[in-house]
Amino acid sequence: TPEVWVQVQMEATELSSFTVHCGFLGPGSISLVTVSWGGPDGAGGTKLAVLHPELGTRQWAPARQARWETQSSISLALEDSGASSPFANTTFCCKFASFPEGSWESCGSLPPSSDPGLSAPPTPVPILRADL
């Protein structure tokens, strides 16, 4: 069964910068990836970026840069303009659509123990949440 992993990291150098990494584990080629925050897109979440493998990417503030890392994984850099760092408690969701197989979605947030001053950025450990 295909799965989606989501990892959220705070940048060690800039506390106001976050990066969301998402990947698709399964067969099929990806047609579209949608990244949202505050919940899944369509269920109260707000769309941050849409990535298409051929037609490019579209992103909305506070997304700074959305890009493909591999054919089945993406990263989204976010710039937190506020001093209170609201991203720390936010859920980020990634939905991967593959034709004709369908869509798979998972959500994740910054691990509560994250302290960018103590260590290098963490290894991408899948944070899985079955079929939302």
């Epitope: 579209l32 369908g102 979605e105 939302l132």
Partner: antibody, heavy 120, light 107 residues
Amino acid sequence: DVKLVESGGGLVKLGGSLKLSCAASGFTFSSYHMSWVRQTPEKRLELVAAINSNVISTYYLDTVKGRFTISRDNAKNTLYLQMSSLKSEDTALYYCARHEDYYGFAMDYWGQGTSVTVSS
Amino acid sequence: SIVMTQTPKFLLVSAGDRVTITCKASQSVTNDVAWYQQKPGQSPKLLMYYVSNHYTGVPDRFIGSGYGTDFTFTISTVQAEDLAVYFCQQAYRSPWTFGGGTKLEIK
């Protein structure tokens, strides 16, 4: 202007074969996923077969697996459905449809349909 | 496969009425739902995608809502040209499946 024009339908005997074609124009055919959808005499819609843009993946309705083959010729901008061992329940109006990635794979363009009647 | 149960099968309404069609999925399909309109003698036409987004040129009297398993399609003020059969469809998981259709007739 996007156009999808189906052809190849007709009256065929039980167990017979037919090949449907769908000529596409007005868009970059090779960039879109395509499907064959049929509408039964009872007006139900069924997605019969689908093929992705890069011809890596296909899908078939369980009841047509092993009997129908979907294919595409991106150089000729044409979608095909080879149907064999036809059954009476294959009688329907067959539409070719285009899927739009940005619309959640919704079918944004449909052809006018070609009728297939399987008789005993 | 995911079953899309659409109700009612028939609707007899007057011009100006508000009508609602419901579609229930047998499992969550998130927001991957489209609605189509099929007028007599024509092929289906896309009205809404991602539940609530209007396809190009579709009037805003057509309204879609829902998430997960329960979806509604509303025509806020029915007009004579809305005489058609309406279908919901899920594109969340293969095989894409359609509702049974709702035939809208105008008094």
